[in-house]
Interface confidence: low
């Protein structure tokens, strides 16, 4: 079928359009183009005869049309009037006619639009602004852009006049933006330049900074005021209602208590005619005095006295702080603070409470600290210690004993031998001792301030012969694979060699055996049951030698995994079941039985007479050692068959 295609369909003024023919029949006589939807001789544009290849213009020919041999029509330099329908009339060789109609539309090229406004300086929350896109153009579509985005949905935005006018009702400062309009038709689109909306607003309630309201006497006061405003606000300062200056900042150097009061900032916008004010109350404080600590007892006695420390001076509405040993107060039932924190009471002082103590007064801008105070706690004397620790000496050597007892003030010392006073010194020295110097040596320590005395007595033996030694132990019943045992050979004697034997043999080499303290102490680490042997220590010097009685180590161990005997697991019905359980353990373990999980008796032997198949099941023996706190168990399955059903079964016990 014969058809006409317009390329393009929408044509801009001044451009060209091609009316392209499709499915043109063969064997043609000629064809003719007409303006309009029908063949009308008065509106013929051009005709074409194939045989002569001659084109003949018609009444509607404008001189801008070109016809091609394929019947297509090109129209150049399009004008608005060219819009509409075009009809092709084809005359075939058999003189049968065929017609086809095509069309196109002509649009003008749009000019660059511009925006006009009815209000160049609208006031926030008061005015409306109407933007209009110029010029008014037929068959054009109008679009609007805000900050290069399409219009937001808002009840304050309204389009009218075929979208040519954009109205912003009740403008706000947020409407300050770049506005553009765009015109479009099928052949062109143009955008205007930006128009920036200048919304007048404010001033808002001003902000005074910094926010602090408390100052110390002698400081500088520097306040700054700011209020959001367009155009920028003009500022004025008032102190206690009296005008000061018209500046954004207020500076007062070296303030005093007299500068306390209400400070008002006023912001004014000359365009909107609005004023807003903010008031801040400034308080100027005088410097507080440096605190100091007083005590109700400068020399308290340990475990007897209480001490009350008070932070001076007393100031109303002040926070008092305390520190001990440069730390904040520890939680202790012996430390009590008064309701106002000014008094710290130490109940029943100890020697560790000496301090130092500090108190602080919290003023508005800082913490002022007292000088540290140290308590002189009177204590002691504790039980005196006599050194060295030797108790056996050989004749002819010098005896030099020293005594010390913790005490404040330092203790005064006295020595007694067999109850007789010797001298008032901390050290006792006797040269070239003999057997006659053997006896009870007593050190007495006395605290003159508290009036307390303590004594320690030491037995000194002077002898050429060494005494029979003995073995002391730090653990008489160690647990296997857990405990260590330290044996010590007593007594400690000067110039003496210490030796050890285990089961009559010298010590074996073992990483678990360690000698220390001049071989006087033998330590066994991680004891095992094999360490349960006889231990002997010996002492010797150039004159004599002696051995201790043996000490046998009692190692607690087990219980090991028990064994149930006899080992048989199959029995004949009617036989007696007699099971015995045994586990290696020290001390002997406690035994208990369970059959199929049900507790039975607490015996080492389980006896059941004349068993039947009902006695089938699991027999568990449980062992526990209360000394080691350990447990163990074993399970055995027993099968009882009816008499004569299975060869080789045990007849039982």
């Amino acid at each position: 079928k014969l058809t006409i295609e317009s390329t393009p369909f929408n044509v801009a003024e001044g451009k060209e359009v091609l009316l392209l023919v499709h499915n043109l029949p063969q064997h043609l006589f000629g064809y003719s183009w007409y303006k309009g939807e029908r063949v009308d001789g008065n509106r013929q544009i051009i005709g074409y005869v194939i045989g002569t290849q001659q084109a003949t213009p018609g009444p509607a020919y404008s001189g801008r049309e070109i016809i091609y041999p394929n019947a297509s029509l090109l129209i150049q330099n399009i004008i608005q009037n060219d819009t509409g329908f075009y009809t092709l009339h084809v005359i075939k060789s058999d003189l049968v006619n065929e017609e086809a109609t095509g069309q196109f539309r002509v649009y003008p090229e749009l000019p660059k639009p511009s925006i006009s406004s009815n209000n160049s300086k609208p006031v926030e929350d008061k005015d409306a602004v109407a933007f209009t896109c110029e010029p008014e153009t037929q068959d054009a579509t109008y679009l609007w852009w805000v900050n290069n985005q399409s219009l937001p949905v808002s009840p304050r935005l309204q389009l009218s006049n075929g979208n040519r006018t954009l109205t912003l009702f009740n403008v706000t400062r947020n409407d300050t933006a770049s506005y553009k309009c765009e015109t479009q038709n099928p052949v062109s689109a143009r955008r205007s330049d930006s128009v920036i909306l200048n919304v007048l607003y404010g001033p808002d309630a001003p902000t005074i900074s910094p926010l602090n309201t408390s100052y110390r006497s002698g400081e500088n006061l520097n306040l700054s005021c700011h209020a959001a405003s367009n155009p920028p606000a003009q500022y004025s300062w008032f102190v206690n209602g009296t005008f000061q200056q018209s500046t954004q900042e207020l500076f007062i150097p070296n303030i005093t208590v007299n500068n306390s009061g209400s400070y008002t900032c006023q912001a004014h916008n000359s365009d909107t005619g609005l004023n807003r004010t903010t008031v801040t109350t400034i308080t100027v404080y005088a410097e507080p005095p440096k605190p100091f600590i007083t005590s109700n007892n400068s020399n308290p006695v340990e475990d007897e006295d209480a001490v009350a420390l008070t932070c001076e001076p007393e100031i109303q509405n002040t926070t008092y702080l305390w520190w001990v040993n440069n730390q904040s107060l520890p939680v202790s039932p012996r430390l009590q603070l008064s309701n106002d924190n000014r008094t710290l009471t130490l109940l029943s002082v100890t020697r560790n409470d000496v301090g130092p103590y500090e108190c602080g007064i919290q003023n508005e801008l800082s913490v002022d600290h007292s000088d540290p105070v140290i308590l002189n706690v009177l204590y002691g004397p504790d039980d005196p210690t006599i050194s060295p620790s030797y108790t056996y000496y050989r004749p002819g050597v010098n005896l030099s004993l020293s005594c010390h007892a913790a005490s404040n003030p330092p203790a005064q010392y006295s020595w007694l031998i067999d109850g007789n006073i010797q001298q008032h010194t901390q050290e006792l020295f006797i040269s070239n001792i003999t057997e006659k110097n053997s006896g009870l040596y007593t050190c007495q320590a006395n605290n003159s301030a508290s009036g307390h005395s303590r004594t320690t007595v030491k037995t000194i033996t002077v002898s050429a012969e060494l005494p029979k030694p003995s073995i002391s132990s730090n653990n008489s019943k160690p647990v296997e694979d857990k405990d260590a045992v330290a044996f010590t050979c007593e007594p400690e004697a000067q110039n003496t060699t210490y030796l050890w034997w285990v089961n009559g043999q010298s010590l074996p080499v073992s990483p678990r055996l360690q000698l220390s303290n001049g071989n006087r102490t033998l330590t066994l680490f991680n004891v095992t049951r094999n360490d349960a042997r006889a231990y002997v220590c010996g002492i010797q010097n150039s004159v004599s030698a002696n051995r201790s009685d043996p000490v046998t180590l009692d190692v607690l161990y087990g219980p090991d995994t028990p064994i149930i005997s006899p080992p048989d697991s199959s029995y004949l019905s009617g036989a007696n079941l007699n099971l015995s359980c045994h586990s290696a353990s020290n001390p002997s373990p406690q035994y208990s039985w369970r059959i199929n999980g049900i507790p039975q008796q607490h015996t080492q032997v389980l006896f059941i007479a004349k068993i039947t198949p009902n006695n089938n099941g699991t027999y568990a023996c449980f062992v526990s050692n209360l000394a080691t706190g350990r447990n163990n168990s074993i399970v055995k399955s027993i099968t009882v068959s009816a008499s004569g059903t299975s060869p080789g079964l045990s007849a039982g016990a």
């Epitope: 602090n212 408390s214 926070t319 702080l321 440069n326 730390q327 919290q362 508005e364 800082s366 913490v367």
Partner: nanobody, 119 residues
Framework: EVQLVESGGGLVQPGGSLRLSCAAS????????IGWVRRAPGKEEELVAA????????RYADSVKGRFTISADTSKNTAYLQMNSLRAEDTAVYYC????????????WGQGTTVTVSS
């Protein structure tokens, strides 16, 4: 000139952590007490934590006890607020302020740092 400058705020999920810093200049923080005060729309201003750096004296609001830790580095003249197990109700502008340890008076303030706790 006295200045307090906060940093470290931001957006964090519930249960998360943030560490706020408060750098002081113009005075010595070991001679005073520093606090963190928060302001949220529709809520009362709250002093959440305070420290007297001289001896590490600290106090906390019940709402943050066990979750927030206040500390100070006197060598850097800086106070910190470590905020753990953050909740939506911790969303606020956090100000560092020179405060009385017992609360009540806030003197020098920083400009604030915003903490938003949201999933």
């Amino acid at each position: 000139e006295v200045q307090l400058v906060e940093s470290g705020g931001g957006l964090v999920q519930p249960g998360g952590s943030l560490r706020l810093s408060c750098a002081a200049s113009g005075f010595n923080i070991k001679d005073t007490c520093i606090g963190w005060v928060r302001r949220a729309p529709g809520k009362e201003e709250e002093l959440v934590a305070a420290i007297c750096p001289y001896k590490g004296y600290t106090r906390y609001a019940d709402s943050v006890k066990g979750r927030f830790t206040i500390s100070a580095d006197t060598s850097k003249n800086t106070a910190y607020l470590q905020m753990n197990s953050l909740r939506a109700e911790d969303t606020a502008v956090y100000y560092c302020a020179n405060v009385a340890y017992s609360g009540g008076h806030y003197n020098y303030w920083g400009q604030g740092t915003t903490v938003t706790v949201s999933s």
